[in-house]
């Protein structure tokens, strides 16, 4: 058996239930619920060995020192006494369940298996106020002398008006010296009315209702107070005071007139002498309510909700504004307005005005601006603005399926918020436009040995100075694509704390320096890059995140990323730009070369012919030609192989200058950017 804590419900089962119960077993489970509750027990399943008088195996239920029955068998068994769905109820908060089994479960020599029982119990409120005398049960509690009030888990006593509950919390004694009535209406009577009132009373019945109400008194029949034919009320008297002023003294059998006290405070004083058997008095008091003037609006935009024909004390009205207007009280903006009719017949606050909603100055759009399509500078309800991006360097981010006409259009709403149909309160984003140089490089001439770049030819070009010169390309407005080996060169130790100096926006090194370096927030090197493997440039790709976004312009624009393999077609011409070595001298200006994508097999053969051990993998491509005297050179590392996409007229970074750089001596090897696009996007997304 399990100890049953004082819970409000639970279950009791035979041991091992629903498996057969053991022989030679007896235990008592004490089910206890909190004081003030009774226990109700019902069997859900019952399967015990049947016997005459339940002598062998049985469940005995008892409570309040009484047995509630002894049970065995199962539904439908000819022998035994199953409990069925009977509800067992205790009077107190305890119930005992004794389960007894004998030495065997046998029937005609066959061993039988009985499952036992499953019972549920619950705490049920004990109504201590219900009369118990009928059932002949002894009441553990003394009864209330006057009134009994049951609540879940207990009870309490109270007394009729004019009596006081004594210390024993059950008995009552006459005490009417300070009876207070605060309800808006009710009945008041002398003690024991309409039976004779007790002697020697000094009763004071006070009626106190809210100001704004006036009390009316109406006496009922019978009215009967001891009096004398010659002397006015010498024995017992009922005196009535309103606002402290005596408005009458009554006795005899003549009912007083209906009284309008014009007051919210009335006292009834009832004095009796030591004798008499008059029946007393009873009155009904009611209240009437004061009225307030009809509310009137101060402007055409104010609305009084559900206007009533009249308003009395405690009534209220709610004022709102027409759409696009807001409530103003003095200089204060209100979210709501309620006026309450006061006890003196005035409204507790003055009528507000309604003023048009103001959305305030529209938010500034980074890399863009806005113009008013309604009156310039007016930011009130129904005003409209159009956000736009600084083109051609930025373009507004569009949602799939959004209407062109609604793009960037924001309206001042009735809520006082600038809102767009699609984006809601969010302002648009101006996204960098990639691969659209304002001054693209001329592609017609064939250049041998490279050439000086003009401003705006390669606006994505980044000049890095980390372990010496290097290059990179701008992606978006805060990312730089470069080679991993510019950050972690092969001949250096793994722990490199070189300063990361990055310059953008010019073709001249000196001018770049003047423009100042861009601090780096984060460096992300591809996990496949191995600094310690000299001949393996696998994963030679890295991203630098700038601390601050750059402002794009004609000399500073990002390059696009490739989206298909056609960018690596044999013979496709691309451009490599950089500030690297040129004819064994460090360049002061950005230079570029135009190179064809080479045949991977030819590059492989060329490498082997030179007895080089370098890894040339699927994640690389080669460009140039052994016979061409043009190639990238030291200092160009990390720069990109840029190809113009004829379909979109956009420039795409298909490669990163990686290795095999011999300065016009054979093929150059590039990281194949297409294979790393997913990694690049993931890295860039993580920070967005």
């Amino acid at each position: 058996s399990i100890p049953i804590p004082q819970k409000l419900f639970g279950e009791v089962t035979s041991p091992l239930f629903p498996k057969p119960y053991p022989n030679n077993f007896e235990t008592t489970t004490v089910i206890t619920v909190p004081t003030g509750y009774r226990v109700k027990l019902v069997f859900q399943q019952f399967d015990l060995e049947p016997s005459e008088g339940c002598f062998y195996d049985y469940v005995k239920i008892s409570a309040d020192k009484k047995s509630l029955g002894r049970f065995c068998g199962q539904l439908g068994s000819p022998l035994g006494n199953p409990p069925g769905k009977k509800e067992f109820m205790s009077q107190g908060n305890k119930m005992l369940l004794t389960f007894h089994t004998d030495f065997s479960n046998e029937e005609n020599g066959t061993i039988m298996f009985y499952k036992g029982f499953l019972a549920y119990y619950q705490a049920v409120d004990l109504d201590e106020c219900a009369s118990r005398s009928k059932s002949g049960e002894e009441d553990p509690q003394p009864q209330c002398q006057h009134l009994c009030h049951n609540y879940v888990g207990g009870y309490f006593c109270s007394c009729r008006p004019g009596y006081e509950l004594q210390e024993d919390t059950h008995s009552c004694q006459a005490e009417c010296s300070s009876e207070l009535y605060t309800e808006a209406s009710g009945y008041i009577s002398s003690l024991e009315y309409p039976r004779s009132y007790p002697p020697d009373l000094r009763c004071n019945y006070s009626i106190r209702v809210e100001r704004g109400l006036t009390l009316h008194l109406k006496f009922l029949e019978p009215f009967d107070i001891d009096d004398h034919q010659q002397v006015h009320c010498p024995y017992d008297q009922l005196q009535i005071y309103a606002n402290g002023k005596n408005i009458g003294e009554f006795c005899g059998k003549q009912r007083p007139p209906d009284l309008d006290t014009s007051s919210n405070a009335v006292d009834l004083l009832f004095f009796t002498d030591e004798s008499g058997d008059s029946r007393g008095w009873k009155l009904r008091y009611t209240t009437e309510i004061i009225k307030c003037p009809q509310p009137k609006t101060l402007d055409e935009f104010t609305i009084i909700q559900n206007l009533q024909p009249q308003y009395q004390f405690r009534d209220y009205f709610i004022a709102t504004c027409k759409q696009g207007y807001q409530l103003i009280e003095g200089n204060q903006v209100l979210h709501s307005f309620t006026a309450v009719c006061q006890d003196d017949g005035t409204w507790h606050r003055a009528m507000p005005r309604c003023k048009i909603k103001d959305c305030g100055q529209p938010r500034n759009l980074p890399n863009g601006d806005f113009r008013y399509t309604t009156t310039m500078g007016v930011n009130t309800y129904k005003a409209r603005i159009q956000y736009y991006c600084h083109e051609p360097y930025y373009k507004m981010q569009t949602r799939a399926g959004s209407r062109e006409s609604e793009q960037g259009v924001y309206t001042c709403t009735a809520q006082g918020i600038w809102k767009n149909e699609q984006k809601g309160e969010k302002i648009p984003r101006c996204l960098p436009v990639c691969g659209k140089p304002v001054n693209p490089v001329e592609q017609r001439q064939r250049i041998i040995g490279g050439q000086k770049a003009k401003m705006g030819n390669f606006p994505w070009q980044v000049f890095t100075n980390i372990h010496g010169r290097g290059g990179g390309a701008l992606l978006g407005d805060r990312w730089i694509l470069t080679a991993a080996h510019t950050l972690y060169p092969k001949e250096h130790e793994a722990q490199s704390n070189a300063s990361l100096d990055v310059f953008l926006g010019h073709t001249n090194v000196e001018e770049l320096m003047k423009l100042g370096n861009h601090p780096i927030r984060r460096v992300s090197v591809h996990p496949d890059y191995r600094q310690d493997e000299s001949y393996n440039f696998e994963g030679d790709i890295a991203l630098l995140e700038l601390e601050n976004s750059v402002t794009l312009g004609p000399n500073l624009l990002p390059i696009c990323l490739p989206d298909n393999d056609t960018f690596y077609d044999l013979g496709l011409m691309g451009y490599v730009s950089g500030f690297g070595v040129m004819e064994e001298k460090i360049a002061h200006d950005l230079r570029f070369v135009r190179l064809p994508v080479a045949n991977p097999q030819a590059c492989e053969n060329w490498l082997r012919g030179k007895n080089r051990m370098d890894v040339f993998s699927q994640n690389m491509f080669c460009a140039g030609h052994p016979s061409l005297k043009q190639d990238a050179c030291q200092g160009d590392s990390g720069g990109v192989f840029a190809v113009r996409d004829p379909n979109t007229d956009r420039w795409v970074a298909t490669g990163i200058v990686s290795w095999g750089i011999g300065c016009s001596r054979g093929y150059g090897f590039y990281t194949k950017v297409l294979n790393y696009v997913d990694w690049i996007k993931k890295e860039m997304e993580e920070e967005d």
Epitope: S1, I2, P3, P15, P22, N24, F25, E26, T27, T28, T29, V30, S62, K65, K66, S67, G92, K94, L96, T98, H100, E138
Partner: antibody, heavy 114, light 111 residues
Framework: QEQLKESGGGLVTPGGTLTLTCTAS????????MSWVRQAPGKGLDWIGI?????SAYYATWAKGRFTISKTSTTVDLKITSPTTEDTATYFC??????????WGPGTLVTVSS | AQVLTQTPFSVSAAVGGTVTINCQAS??????LAWYQQKPGQPPKLLIY???DLASGVPSRFKGSGSGKQFTLTISGVQCDDAATYFC?????????????FGGGTKVEIK
């Protein structure tokens, strides 16, 4: 034959601790509620408490805090904490069956003396 | 608190006679009462349970009766072996723990 036997009695000094043990033969202790009763020399029977098969113990009001009933699969123990000379008595264990106690052990005498 | 009062305190009977022992409960206990016999130096022995049911191996000269508050143990055809102290006990031990469940005892002497 169903039998009970108490052990662990003897002389104990006031304020000490003593544990009495009840063992059964012929039936399993884990199948019945077990009770402890004591009898001072020449006096009547005093019920101390009972433990049911689930391990819930119930005590006479006077015994609460002074006595602890516990059980294992083979024994029922009565721990007497800080005994006084008034606790000198023969202590019986009994099996509760049909709201009565049957069988009883022969008892074990506990003498509290300094 | 539930109290069991046994009367008489002691009784003397002749062999072959009848002894009647009373047990009165301060509150109704239904038929939940047992009777025991205890001889000096021995533990109590169950005679009657549930007010009137004879325990296994107990001679039929022992008879229990009563319910509610008033109970009686009758020994008819008293024998020498019946000299002992007899105790009554109520079975409501789980819900009247504020009192002793045993009566004070009645000593029976055989003349």
């Amino acid at each position: 034959q169903e039998q009970l036997k108490e052990s662990g009695g003897g002389l104990v000094t006031p304020g000490g601790t003593l544990t009495l043990t009840c063992t059964a033969s012929g039936f399993s202790l884990s199948s019945y509620d077990m009770s402890w009763v004591r009898q001072a020399p020449g006096k009547g029977l005093d019920w101390i408490g009972i433990i049911n098969t689930g391990g819930s113990a119930y005590y006479a009001t006077w015994a609460k805090g002074r006595f602890t009933i516990s059980k294992t699969s083979t024994t029922v123990d009565l721990k007497i904490t800080s005994p006084t000379t008034e606790d000198t008595a023969t202590y019986f264990c009994g099996r509760k069956i049909n709201d009565a106690f049957d069988p009883w052990g022969p008892g074990t005498l506990v003498t509290v003396s300094s | 608190a539930q109290v069991l009062t046994q009367t008489p305190f002691s009784v003397s009977a002749a062999v072959g006679g009848t002894v009647t022992i009373n047990c009165q409960a301060s509150e109704s206990i239904s038929s939940n009462l047992a009777w025991y016999q205890q001889k000096p130096g021995q533990p109590p022995k169950l005679l009657i349970y549930d007010a009137s049911d004879l325990a296994s191996g107990v001679p039929s000269r022992f008879k229990g009766s009563g319910s509610g508050k008033q109970f009686t143990l009758t020994i008819s055809g008293v024998q020498c072996d019946d000299a002992a102290t007899y105790f009554c006990q109520h079975g409501w031990i789980y819900d009247t723990i504020d009192s002793n469940c045993f009566g004070g005892g009645t000593k029976v002497e055989i003349k």
